[in-house]
């Protein structure tokens, strides 16, 4: 759930590494409320997610590796 | 090595609710999810949830939304599912399973089920 | 939600033929697929992850294959004990559907 690229809450599903191709960053300041995790789907959909959760840790954790390969 | 162990079968009234254990033993229990999936007499199997003992955090099926709660208590290393407003088609054999994100998400160890039944 | 659908939902066989079971998804799961046996009376067993890995201490009679949205799981020479009903899953992303399940049959 987003408003003008701003993650407004999180989804409530876990997704599978398989189906992210990438992800950003979003802090919280003057325009966006939430920190969040940005994924970004094989279906060009952007998933906002909790970055405290250990799913989404985990994710990111193994996208970063991919990038540092890379 | 790697045991779930699950509480008793249960025989409840329609409208009671139920609370169903799984005792995990054998490995890290932080490290892994604990997912909750069902199946009626003579039926498939249905995903009704998991949780993550790591962070308490919890994702259900919508069809059990409302009705259902996962809970975890690291210091025994024990998940539970309860299961309100309880009809007679919540009558089924309940399994706890690992979630292993190491082996593409599969549930790699599984509970021995505990059967619930529900009638008046 | 992802709807997966198996097929057949029964299949009478004998011991040394070789078995398909196929499962498709409503939607791309990209390889997000695993495969499951349950014995009557028993909790599942996984055996296949990631729609082609052999679980630990699966034998090599069975593979799996499949990409996309169509999935299977073969047998290549059925044994007595693999006589059991076998299910996909979906865990592309929750809730994690499961198929309605293959009941394999003693011809």
């Known amino acids: 759930a987003s408003n003008f690229d701003c993650c407004l809450r999180y989804t409530d599903r876990i997704l599978h590494p398989k189906f992210i191709v990438g992800f950003t960053q979003q802090l919280a300041n003057e325009t966006c409320d939430i920190n969040a995790v940005v994924f970004h789907t094989k279906k060009g959909l952007s998933v906002c997610a909790n970055p405290k959760q250990t799913w989404v840790k985990l994710i990111v954790r193994r996208l970063s590796k991919k990038i540092n390969k890379m | 090595q790697v045991q779930l162990v699950q509480s008793g079968a249960e025989v409840k009234k329609p409208g009671a609710s139920v609370k169903v254990s799984c005792k995990a033993s054998?490995?890290?229990?932080?490290?892994?999810?604990m997912h909750w999936v069902r199946q009626a007499p003579g039926q498939g199997l249905e995903w009704m949830g998991v949780?993550?003992?790591?962070?308490?955090?919890?994702t259900y099926a919508q069809k059990f939304q409302g009705r259902v709660t996962m809970t975890v208590d690291t210091s025994t290393s024990t998940v539970y599912m309860e299961l309100s407003s309880l009809r007679s088609e919540d009558t089924a054999v309940y399994y706890c399973?690992?979630?292993?994100?190491?082996?593409?998400?599969?549930?790699?160890?599984w509970g021995q089920g505990t059967l619930v039944t529900v009638s008046s | 939600d992802i709807q997966m659908t198996q097929s057949p939902s029964s299949l009478s066989a004998s011991v040394g033929d070789r078995v398909t079971i196929t499962c498709r998804a409503s939607e791309n799961i990209y390889g997000a697929l695993n495969w499951y046996q349950q014995k009557p009376g028993k909790a599942p067993k996984l055996l296949i992850y990631g729609a082609t890995n052999l679980a630990d201490g699966v034998p090599s009679r069975f593979s799996g294959s499949g990409s996309g949205r169509q999935y299977s799981l073969t047998i290549s020479s059925l044994q007595p004990e693999d006589f059991a009903t076998y299910y996909c899953?979906?865990?592309?992303?929750?809730?994690?559907?499961f198929g309605g399940g293959t009941k394999l049959e003693i011809k």
């Open positions: 399973a690992r979630g292993n994100y190491g082996v593409d998400y599969a549930m790699d160890y």
């Open positions: 899953q979906n865990v592309l992303i929750t809730p994690y559907t």
């Open positions: 054998g490995y890290t229990f932080t490290n892994y999810w």
């Open positions: 949780i993550d003992p790591s962070d308490s955090y919890t």
